[in-house]
């Protein structure tokens, strides 16, 4: 088809443009370029033929034009007026015609434009600020940049007049900045000169330096005052209410006791007409004083109170030292010291923080030591500890129970025997037990200070029986090669053998097998899959001997490297394709499959009917287990043969 | 593409038995195994039991044991679900589901389900 | 048998609204757990399994987190279109056993 492709589409003004024809009928007798969407005699403007290579203008023909063999036509030195529809009329040599019809846009060369403002020194949080991008141009698009970057999304930036206008509310000394406007059109894209805004602002509250307010007789005094403050703050000075000067250090030599007393700095913006004092009190010290811990906590609670540790009193140029247990202090994350080394905080204190701490002031010729400082900190009560920890007892023996609940103040305790209360001691004594005596022993551990209690309770059983003992372990699904398992024969009794079994069979010897606390607990390192196995503790005593049920361990592990079976790797074409993929894995492997490295189904048997050579390529098996973490693939390549008489072809399942 | 189309809905009383069917197509039926879940009336999902339609393999919950028997035709690929001795707290929408894989996958395709009402 | 406790049972909240439904195992399942929608009058559609794979063609606003015993479901911009109940499912060995479900609603 006959189609007009204009280069460019977009044309600025006094450059040219070229009307492109494609696929360009053959056997022509010549052609004719129109002005619009249709042929129109009083609209050409160039008709060419091919016979005699002749080109005549028509009416609409303005002497820019070049019409070229091809049939494509050149408008050069474009004007607003070009803008528009082209048609071109062919005609063949059997005299039928064809047409087709193009378009391009002419924009101006934009100028380069310019901001103008509606206020050049707005007052913070008082005034609004207008930016209009001059000229106003049609057909533009208009862009504003702040310190080169795009505008920030903000609710004080308002854009209004298609773009053209940028309006900043409540005007804040963070607007400072530079800004820069931008028009484009299709064919252009200028960019204004930047503006910057010069925001009043201030003065802010001044800040006086240095900020440590005690001195020692004889030195030199050198305040310094700022406040932030557009146009720069003018500064003045008073002492004890007395105007001294109108400057921003202010610096008296050589000061004794009397210089004491409230200093003052005023800063004033004469622009905005504003005021901002700050007044700091200045102490000078005859000699320098004996330091002197203070806290801001006497009690702290553990693990939910900080404690702040100041060394008295502050002193220019001084070197603060600190102590703690005798020892200068230790690096840790809970121990932070100020800037100036005068205040040691303690976070999240805990019962091992108890100090002492000192402090030392360095002076030119020793240091001063302040009074050690313990600190007081409330924990507890813990879960109590009711020993011994036997649970089994035979009848006739004494009982006897010792509790202890580490708490700051100590604990107050409590015993209760099946939810009655007995005494109010730590230990607890019955003589010449029975089978009655068999019940919930619970201690009850009380600290007065923090209200907080906790309790233990122990099943004391009074039997000449052994009970049936059971396994408890510390790790029910433990990972092959990572984990560790511990097994405990329960319950713990006094007098009594513990003995074990794996499969019926006593312990193997094994560098991985351990048995401690009295052959009461039996611990296996790095399981394997083989220790998947049954496990029995026994107990037995002069009276009497018993077994556990059997706990079978369940090892986690794989996904071991698959195995895709069958084997074959070359097949003829029309077989069917049945791989089987198989990992040993507990839980049983997620199976997925790839060909070609693209995904395919999540089964263990990949069936393909009647492949053909277009089913060559790689087959992956992926195999994946969560509950160990791991995964684990294998890749096979599969040929597959047009021809039937290949030796050492699979037939296919 | 894949579908299950099971049975219609059936009505049966106390102590009878129902055999619901689940016909399977557009994959490989042998490849993927296939569960059984129902719904009581404005309940949740309860998961009943699956087979394997490749060897015939099947597990049931603990709760169904001794009343649900599952079979399978890979002539017709449809597999069965029989629940004997219903009792009314049997009326359910009983829903056949395709495993997106094999071993330790979630349900990828349903049937529609089938509405087995139990009443005297 | 492994318990799946869900929660809430049900929830209100407006289109946009990020709404988060949590799923608790009574026994670690790793991270074989899957979630599903269902609408009224229609089976359950798998979303999300192993915890955090989004099933295909389902929308990226839904997504999954967690592994062990606890477990969320997230829909970052809630729709009128994802009225429906959710059930969370454990995938670990049979048997496969169900969260009661949480009935989400458009306030």
């Known amino acids: 088809k006959l189609t007009i492709e204009s280069t460019p589409f977009n044309v600025a003004e006094g450059k040219e443009v070229l009307l492109l024809v494609h696929n360009l009928p053959q056997h022509l007798f010549g052609y004719s370029w129109y002005k619009g969407e249709r042929v129109d005699g009083n609209r050409q403007i160039i008709g060419y033929v091919i016979g005699t290579q002749q080109a005549t203008p028509g009416p609409a023909y303005s002497g820019r034009e070049i019409i070229y063999p091809n049939a494509s036509l050149l408008i050069q030195n474009i004007i607003q007026n070009d803008t528009g529809f082209y048609t071109l009329h062919v005609i063949k040599s059997d005299l039928v015609n064809e047409e087709a019809t193009g378009q391009f846009r002419v924009y101006p060369e934009l100028p380069k434009p310019s901001i103008s403002s509606n206020n050049s020194k707005p007052v913070e949080d008082k005034d609004a600020v207008a930016f209009t991008c001059e000229p106003e141009t049609q057909d533009a698009t208009y862009l504003w940049w702040v310190n080169n970057q795009s505008l920030p999304v903000s609710p004080r930036l308002q854009l209004s007049n298609g773009n053209r206008t940028l309006t900043l509310f409540n005007v804040t000394r963070n607007d400072t900045a530079s800004y820069k406007c931008e028009t484009q059109n299709p064919v252009s894209a200028r960019r204004s000169d930047s503006v910057i805004l010069n925001v009043l602002y201030g003065p802010d509250a001044p800040t006086i330096s240095p900020l440590n307010t005690s001195y020692r007789s004889g030195e030199n005094l050198n305040l310094s005052c700022h406040a932030a403050s557009n146009p720069p703050a003018q500064y003045s000075w008073f002492v004890n209410g007395t105007f001294q000067q109108s400057t921003q250090e202010l610096f008296i030599p050589n000061i004794t006791v009397n210089n004491s007393g409230s200093y003052t700095c005023q800063a004033h913006n004469s622009d905005t007409g504003l005021n901002r004092t700050t007044v700091t009190t200045i102490t000078v010290y005859a000699e320098p004083p004996k330091p002197f811990i203070t806290s801001n906590n006497s009690n702290p609670v553990e693990d939910e109170d900080a404690v702040a540790l100041t060394c008295e009193p502050e002193i220019q140029n001084t070197t603060y030292l600190w102590w703690v247990n005798n020892q200068s202090l230790p690096v840790s994350p809970r121990l932070q010291l100020s800037n100036d080394n005068r205040t040691l905080t303690l976070l999240s204190v805990t019962r091992n923080d108890v100090g002492p701490y000192e402090c030392g002031i360095q002076n030119e010729l020793s240091v001063d030591h302040s009074d050690p400082v313990i600190l007081n900190v409330l924990y507890g009560p813990d879960d109590p500890t009711i020993s011994p920890s036997y649970t089994y007892y035979r009848p006739g023996v004494n009982l006897s129970l010792s509790c202890h609940a580490a708490s700051n103040p100590p604990a107050q305790y409590s015993w209760l025997i099946d939810g009655n209360i007995q005494q109010h001691t730590q230990e607890l004594f019955i003589s010449n037990i029975t089978e009655k005596n068999s019940g919930l022993y619970t201690c009850q551990a009380n600290n007065s200070a923090s209200g907080h209690s906790r309790t233990t309770v122990k099943t004391i059983t009074v039997s000449a029986e052994l009970p049936k003992p059971s396994i408890s372990s510390n790790n029910s699904k433990p990972v092959e090669d990572k984990d560790a398992v511990a097994f405990t024969c329960e319950p713990e009794a006094q007098n009594t053998t513990y003995l074990w079994w794996v499969n019926g069979q006593s312990l193997p010897v094994s560098p991985r097998l351990q048995l401690s606390n009295g052959n009461r607990t039996l611990t296996l390192f790095n399981v394997t899959r083989n220790d998947a196995r049954a496990y029995v503790c026994g107990i037995q005593n002069s009276v009497s001997a018993n077994r556990s049920d059997p706990v079978t361990l369940d090892v986690l592990y794989g996904p071991d490297t698959p195995i895709i079976s069958p084997p074959d790797s070359s097949y003829l074409s029309g077989a069917n394709l049945n791989l089987s993929c198989h990992s040993a894995s507990n839980p049983s492997p997620q199976y997925s499959w790839r060909i070609n490295g693209i995904p395919q189904q999540h089964t263990q048997v990949l069936f393909i009917a009647k492949i053909t050579p277009n089913n060559n390529g790689t087959y992956a098996c992926f195999v994946s287990n969560l509950a160990t973490g791991r995964n684990n693939s294998i890749v096979k390549s599969i040929t597959v043969s047009a021809s039937g008489t290949s030796p050492g072809l699979s037939a296919g399942a | 593409q894949v579908q299950l189309v099971q049975s219609g809905a059936e009505v049966k009383k106390p102590g009878a038995s129902v055999k619901v069917s689940c016909k399977a197509s557009g994959y490989i039926f042998t490849s993927y195994w296939l569960h059984w879940v129902r719904q009581a009336p404005g309940q949740g999902l309860e998961w009943i039991g699956y087979?394997?339609?490749?060897?015939?393999?099947?597990s049931y919950a603990q709760k169904f044991q001794g009343r649900v028997t599952m079979t399978r035709d890979t002539s017709t690929s449809t597999v069965y679900m029989e629940l004997s001795s219903l009792r009314s707290e049997d009326t359910a929408v009983y829903y056949c589901?395709?495993?997106?894989?094999?071993?330790?996958?979630?349900?990828?395709?349903w049937g529609q389900g089938t509405l087995v009402t139990v009443s005297s | 048998d492994i318990q799946m406790t869900q929660s809430p049972s049900s929830l209100s909240a407006s289109v946009g609204d990020r709404v988060t439904i949590t799923c608790r195992a009574s026994?670690?399942?790793?991270?074989?757990l899957a979630w599903y929608q269902q609408k009224p009058g229609k089976v359950p559609k798998l979303l999300i399994y192993n915890a955090k794979n989004l099933v295909e063609g389902v929308p990226s606003r839904f997504s999954g987190s967690g592994s062990g015993t606890d477990f969320t479901l997230t829909i970052s911009s809630l729709q009128p279109e994802d009225v429906a109940t959710y059930y969370c499912?454990?995938?670990?060995?049979?048997?496969?056993?169900f969260g009661q479900g949480t009935k989400v609603e458009i306030k």
């Open positions: 589901a395709r495993e997106y894989g094999n071993y330790n996958y979630p349900l990828d395709y």
């Open positions: 087979i394997n339609p490749q060897t015939g393999y099947t």
């Open positions: 499912q454990h995938h670990y060995g049979t048997p496969y056993t």
């Open positions: 026994e670690n399942i790793y991270g074989y």
